[in-house]
């Protein structure tokens, strides 16, 4: 109670402070900061119990996207979609919820993070956890054996998210997958090429793609003396090596998962190694590993993969890392994960720790799980962790204090005198019909200064100004907002001139 009283007092004081600053005509920035503080204090105060029980907020692990954030998001999506299309992918969509049965048994330990929906007329439903399992269901259901597709959509995980690190309960995934029987490692290499192209285009900093193979992992566990039943759980321990030390991983394997210390030590000798194709060669010579059929297949495929990656010019971005053991149960072959080496923080700043920004692998058995006859469709794919990328791009833009345009308006139709609303409406309509992105202020007689100010704030590059004299002369004054230079343009040439100045094609094809 005393706590609430203190907070109420602070809200009152802060309210007075804001009013005082406004009266003193303090700087806009200072007022903005103090208003933000007031809102934060009010948010902590919450609703007065007597007045209102309901707290207005988005559910845990979700967020709204502001126009600024949407502008960032659309730019990121544009880069990704252009790349997917460049590689010949078709696009599909699937329902946001699936039959619970569809998702069961596909995610191993992560199944507990699936959102189940309340009964809707007898069907047990769950929100999709990723886009891969619905894709496999789509292939099996439609009896497709061959497709290259991308899918960008929201997925849902009942996680405890660290939202500052770009982790949410509702988030976008951008998936690209190739399904079909092809010669080994060619589609896999293309997936890695796509991953590198996208991460390079986004300019979010230097990255490295770690590559491994599920068969090498399984073979390695077998020769080290891990029982089949413990493969998956030991995998999840090994996968933590990018975050914690070998000692901690070993303690977990021995202490919590009941592995013999000498078995753990044998695993440690392998999983702490990483390198390039030379490490593949080295392991092919390993007397124990090379005797394991699974591991030998995996190493052979990785050797081939590195040849193709060299031809694609991305071998310098790839590291063969034996500790990579991605958690999902459905991977059967090559697996990969892209991590940022350092985000482009300003000098003297710590790099942002956002972990993995893309991942994927081969899952040849997943479609077969849905086929009554168990017919397999080999698949390989990748997923771009866009939420983490949005976080990095947003923080980078914030650090650079870069202004982002949230609209694409090319021109504002303005008037220099009163009583010209009808003329403005006619002109803006002409521009819209010609495919020009145009706006006008919703006032009968707006001041010219206000109209110009609006353009500056919204980043609109051009103003088409109508005046009495211009109407008589059949011209429109076209003003550049940044250079303030004005030219008279004949009304019939206006559309062409705006398109020329904004670099838009002259016909809407």
């Amino acid at each position: 109670m005393a706590e609430r009283a203190a907070l109420e007092e602070l809200v009152k004081l802060q309210g007075e402070r804001v009013r005082g600053l406004k009266q003193q005509k303090a700087s806009a920035e200072l007022i903005e900061e103090e208003v933000a503080k007031l809102l934060k204090l009010k948010a902590q105060l919450g609703p007065d119990e007597s007045k209102q029980k309901f707290v207005l907020k988005t559910p845990k692990g979700t967020r709204d996207y502001s126009p600024r954030q949407m502008a960032v998001r659309e730019k990121v999506f544009d880069v990704i979609i252009r790349c997917f299309k460049r590689h010949g992918a078709e696009v599909i969509d699937t329902p946001v919820f699936e039959l619970k049965e569809t998702l069961m048994g596909k995610y191993g330990e992560d199944s507990k993070l699936i959102y189940d929906l309340k009964d809707q007329g007898g069907e047990l439903l769950s929100l999709r956890y990723d886009l891969t399992v619905p894709f496999a269901r789509y292939l099996a259901m439609n009896k497709l054996t061959n497709i290259k597709r991308y899918h960008i959509a929201k997925v849902y995980r009942r996680d405890n998210p660290a939202m500052t690190r770009g982790r949410y309960r509702e988030f976008y995934q951008c998936d690209f997958d190739i399904a079909g029987n092809f010669d080994p490692m060619i589609p896999d290499a293309e997936c890695l090429k796509i991953m590198c192209e996208i991460l390079s285009s986004l300019q979010i900093g230097d990255f490295l793609v770690k590559v491994n193979d599920r068969r090498i992992l399984d073979g390695m566990f077998a020769i080290c003396g891990v029982s089949d039943s413990k493969f998956r759980t030991i995998c999840s321990s090994v996968d933590k090596l990018d975050k914690v030390s070998w000692e901690e991983v070993k303690n977990e394997m021995v202490g919590e998962k009941g592995l013999a210390p000498e078995v753990a030590d044998r695993i440690g000798d392998y999983v702490q190694q990483h390198g390039g194709v030379s490490l593949v060669e080295q392991l092919l010579q390993d007397p124990k590993l090379s005797q394991n059929k699974q591991a030998l297949e995996g190493l052979g495929d990785l050797k081939l993969l590195f040849e193709y990656l060299t031809l694609f010019g991305i071998d310098d971005k790839i590291s063969f890392d034996l500790s990579l053991a991605r958690g999902l149960d459905y991977y059967t072959g090559v697996i990969y994960e892209a991590v940022l080496l350092q985000t482009p923080a300003q000098a003297g700043e710590e790099p942002l720790g956002v972990g993995s920004v893309a991942a994927g692998g081969r899952y040849d058995g997943l479609v077969g799980m849905f086929d009554p006859k168990g017919r397999k469709v080999p698949c390989v794919g990748l997923s771009i962790g866009v939420e983490r990328i949005f976080s990095i791009v947003e923080q980078r833009l914030e650090a650079l204090e870069e202004k982002i345009r949230t609209t694409e308006t090319q021109v504002l139709v303005a008037s220099a005198q009163k009583k010209l609303l009808e003329e403005r409406l006619k002109l803006v309509s002409e521009l819209w019909d010609a495919g020009i992105k145009a706006e006008l202020l919703y006032k009968k007689n707006p001041k010219l200064l206000n109209q110009l100010q609006y353009c500056e704030e919204a980043g609109i590059p051009l103003v088409a100004i109508i005046g009495e004299q211009e109407l008589k002369d059949g011209v429109i004054k076209l003003r550049s907002v940044t250079s303030r230079e004005e030219v008279d343009v004949r009304r019939e040439d206006l559309v062409e001139e705006i398109k020329r100045r904004t670099g838009q094609p002259l016909c809407i094809c």
């Epitope: 907070l7 007092e9 602070l10 900061e33 503080k37 500052t164």
Partner: antibody
Framework: QVQLVESGGGLVKPGGSLRLSCAAS????????MTWIRQAPGKGLEWVSY????????DYADSVKGRFTISRDNAKNSLYLQMNSLRDEDTAVYFC?????????????WGQGTLVTVSS | DIQMTQSPSSVSASVGDRVTITCRAS??????LAWYQQKPGRAPKLLIF???SLQSGVPSRFSGSGSGTHFTLTISSLQPEDFATYYC?????????FGQGTKLEIK
């Protein structure tokens, strides 16, 4: 429980640079304004700089403006103070502190402090 | 900048005594005032904020009052652990400034 631990202090020559860090735990770091406050040996307290939770706002005491830079990494729950062109009068124990109720410029939790000595 | 002046600069008292420390601001700061206690070699500890609100976990023998330019910190019955230096601080406008401190010593 809330904990703030400073590090990075030490002996530095006039004109030199130093970077202080403050590791925070036990609260949602990104919600809080954070501040650096210093205390010269045997003297009183001086508010050096602050930074808002979302990095949007910062300010500096006139005595350090242009030489010190405050920053934070919410992903790492860390606050930093980059100190350049250090002077003798910058010798002090530097404390990082958290604003009470996220935004009120009063330190409700403080670190143990890290000593910066500027001397030739 | 707002100047904060504390008085007295030091005070001697005995366990059980009532002690009052005063803080004046060079201009009106409404109730934007905090009081801290600092022991040698330690970080300051927040006692009072918003002039009179007791920070959680602080004993009720500490109390604050005042608004505008004149503020007081009162310790109703001194305990052995209360001997320390006390600072006031204004939180009205940046740069936020502290008083020069009042050292409370054992008589």
């Amino acid at each position: 429980q809330v904990q703030l631990v400073e590090s990075g202090g030490g002996l530095v020559k006039p004109g030199g640079s130093l970077r202080l860090s403050c590791a925070a735990s036990g609260f949602t770091f990104s919600d809080y304004y954070m501040t650096w406050i210093r205390q010269a040996p045997g003297k009183g307290l001086e508010w050096v700089s602050y930074i808002s939770g979302s990095f949007a706002y910062t300010d500096y005491a006139d005595s350090v403006k242009g030489r010190f830079t405050i920053s934070r990494d919410n992903a790492k729950n860390s606050l930093y103070l980059q100190m350049n062109s250090l002077r003798d009068e910058d010798t002090a124990v530097y404390f990082c502190a958290r604003y009470v109720y996220q935004v009120v410029a009063i330190g409700d939790y403080w670190g143990q402090g890290t000593l910066v000595t500027v001397s030739s | 900048d707002i100047q904060m002046t504390q008085s007295p600069s030091s005070v001697s008292a005995s366990v059980g005594d009532r002690v009052t420390i005063t803080c004046r601001a060079s201009q009106g700061i409404s109730s934007w005032l905090a009081w801290y206690q600092q022991k040698p070699g330690r970080a300051p500890k927040l006692l009072i904020f918003a002039a009179s609100s007791l920070q959680s976990g602080v004993p009720s023998r500490f109390s604050g009052s005042g608004s505008g330019t004149h503020f007081t910190l009162t310790i109703s019955s001194l305990q052995p652990e209360d001997f320390a230096t006390y600072y006031c601080q204004q939180a009205k406008s940046f740069p936020y400034t502290f008083g020069q401190g009042t050292k409370l010593e054992i008589k």
